[in-house]
């Protein structure tokens, strides 16, 4: 990364340094330390203060984005004196060169696409690179398949999501022979970016008085159980006047997903389709294929 690290410190320096790969801020240990703390301040004056590591000469920031520029600060007291040091972490490079409109979505349970646009002031030869680190920071994933526009990487396709955790750090770096390119970073929750497939195995069975719809919950990337799903059923009578209201039914997820509704014979031709969402977010999937039941002469 082409970010400058500029230190603002009194004469006897703590030699503060920051490793953006591990998000670890460290400094020279002082003898007889009685107190130490580290924190960062972002451009909106928000302060993040992580726990100190056991050796008390470093701290690790878990959930931070750096692209707007931050200032790290370390305060150390020893039995003799106090130390204070700031470390500026700007996003160096020309303003407006970073990737923008960054977004990702998981689909089909085990695939992910991320897309971005080139920065408005980025030169023609700009090239972007995506790196993903999971919240445990044990592994860095480099984009395996880039989506290109006139030779510039403007997206990434991943078909192996095994390295991801529930929350992940995305970094888009840029390079150019002409000028420095700013980076963009983002923290994304997998639960917020997953698009579910519609429910599967939808069946309708009718007797003389009722119809029973059954379905299976969609396969998902997240580890979800039945209560995490909400379903919507669209039961639609065929050949009705345009503008007639469809019957939309909300059903909570259960171990056996079913919906039983009164429908006596002879019954007109109907169709039913179902969609699924995470009950906490209600980001609806597309509809399942319509299943028809009943008869034209009902």
């Amino acid at each position: 990364e082409k970010s400058d690290l500029r230190t603002v410190a009194p004469a006897s320096s703590l030699n503060v340094r920051f490793d953006s790969r591990t998000m670890n801020l460290s400094w020279d240990c002082q003898e007889n330390t009685t107190f130490s703390k580290c924190f960062l301040t972002d451009k909106k004056n928000r302060v993040v203060e992580p726990r100190l590591s056991n050796n008390e000469c470093s701290c690790t920031f878990r959930e931070i984005c750096l692209h707007e520029g931050v200032t790290f600060e370390v305060h150390v007291n020893t039995s003799q004196r106090g130390f204070q040091q700031k470390l500026l972490y700007p996003n160096s490079g020309r303003e407006g060169t970073a990737a923008q409109n960054f977004s990702c979505f998981i689909y089909n349970a085990d695939l992910m696409n991320c897309t971005w646009a080139r920065g408005p002031t980025a030169p023609r030869d700009v090239q972007y690179f995506l790196y993903i680190r999971n919240s445990k920071r044990r592994r860095e994933i480099r984009c395996p398949y880039y989506i290109q526009d006139s030779g510039t990487h403007v997206g990434c396709h991943l078909d192996n999501l095994s390295g991801l955790t529930s929350r992940n750090y995305f970094l888009v770096n840029g390079t150019s022979r002409e000028i420095g390119i700013q980076f963009f970073d983002s923290l994304l929750d997998t639960k917020k970016i997953e698009r579910f497939n519609p429910p599967s195995n939808v069946t309708v069975r009718c007797n003389t008085t009722h119809c029973l719809v059954r379905w299976k919950q969609p396969r998902t990337y997240q580890k979800l159980s039945y209560l995490d799903f909400q379903y919507q059923l669209d039961v639609h009578r065929k050949n009705t006047q345009p503008g007639t209201e469809n019957l939309l039914i909300n059903v909570s997820g259960d171990l056996e997903n079913r919906y039983n509704f009164p429908s006596s014979e002879p019954r007109a031709k109907h169709s039913v389709k179902i969609r699924a969402a995470d009950v906490r977010i209600l980001n609806w999937s597309s509809w399942s294929e319509a299943i028809e039941f009943g008869s034209d002469d009902g």
């Epitope: 979800l224 209560l227 171990l255 009950v279 906490r280």
Partner: antibody, heavy 120, light 111 residues
Framework: QVQLVQSGAEVKKPGASVKVSCKIS????????IHWVRQTPTKGFEWMGG????????VYAQRFQGRVTMTEDTSIDTAYLTLSSLRSDDTAVYYC?????????????WGKGTMVTVSS | QAVLTQPSSVSGAPGQRVTISCTGS?????????VSWYQQLPGTAPKLLIY???KRPSGVPDRFSASKSGTSASLAITGLQADDEADYYC???????????FGGGTKVTVL
């Protein structure tokens, strides 16, 4: 409709072990996550452990670590809880439960409970 | 001593509204982890009433509702009925204990 059928009541001596079973009917155990919870009049409900899909393994509550073992026989859709080195304060009703949501664990279906009495 | 704190009992006349509080800490409800509520009728296993703070499973009447704010949660029962007489428990997850935690239970009496 899914059911969890637990084994019958047990009376054990201090220092002994007990094995409680939980048979699932109406659904395949291999598609479920089973946790075990016990209830005493003095301590109320205590979570003992269960299958964690994130870790892909059975995890145990710290206070039971070393004394508790949870196993599953998916061929007969049965989960087991074994608690060793029993003490009088292990006298409780032991429940198996199906996890309906993982974050945090939420228990959508419960067995009827197995009463375990530890007495000399 | 239960990790989550509930009042030991509440009571109300038929048709009235009662609420049960559940107080936790920054390592459980305030972390923030979702809260579930269970009803236990005498001599039976618990039954899930509320999950993800305010969602009702199929078959649970809308007389039962719940909310969460900060480090505490509450369950409300409106239109109290005789068969609501039971023990009610809140449950969440605690990061410092790495497991599920429960409240001590609240006995609801219908007068």
């Amino acid at each position: 409709q899914v059911q969890l059928v637990q084994s019958g009541a047990e009376v054990k001596k201090p220092g002994a072990s007990v094995k409680v079973s939980c048979k699932i009917s109406g659904h395949s155990l291999s598609e479920l996550s089973i946790h075990w919870v016990r209830q005493t009049p003095t301590k109320g409900f205590e979570w003992m452990g269960g299958f964690d899909p994130e870790e892909n393994e059975i995890v145990y509550a710290q206070r039971f670590q070393g004394r508790v073992t949870m196993t599953e026989d998916t061929s007969i859709d049965t989960a087991y809880l074994t608690l060793s080195s029993l003490r009088s304060d292990d006298t409780a009703v032991y429940y198996c439960a199906i996890v309906g949501s993982f974050s945090p664990p939420t228990y959508g279906y419960w067995g009827k409970g197995t009463m375990v009495t530890v007495s000399s | 001593q239960a990790v989550l704190t509930q009042p030991s009992s509440v009571s109300g006349a038929p048709g009235q509204r009662v609420t049960i509080s559940c107080t936790g800490s920054g390592s459980n409800i305030g972390a923030p982890y979702d809260v579930s509520w269970y009803q236990q009728l005498p001599g039976t296993a618990p039954k899930l009433l509320i999950y993800h703070n305010n969602k009702r499973p199929s078959g649970v009447p809308d007389r039962f509702s719940a909310s969460k704010s900060g480090t505490s949660a509450s369950l409300a029962i409106t239109g109290l009925q005789a068969d609501d007489e039971a023990d009610y428990y809140c449950q969440s997850y605690d990061s410092s204990l790495s497991g599920s935690v429960f409240g001590g239970g609240t006995k609801v009496t219908v007068l």
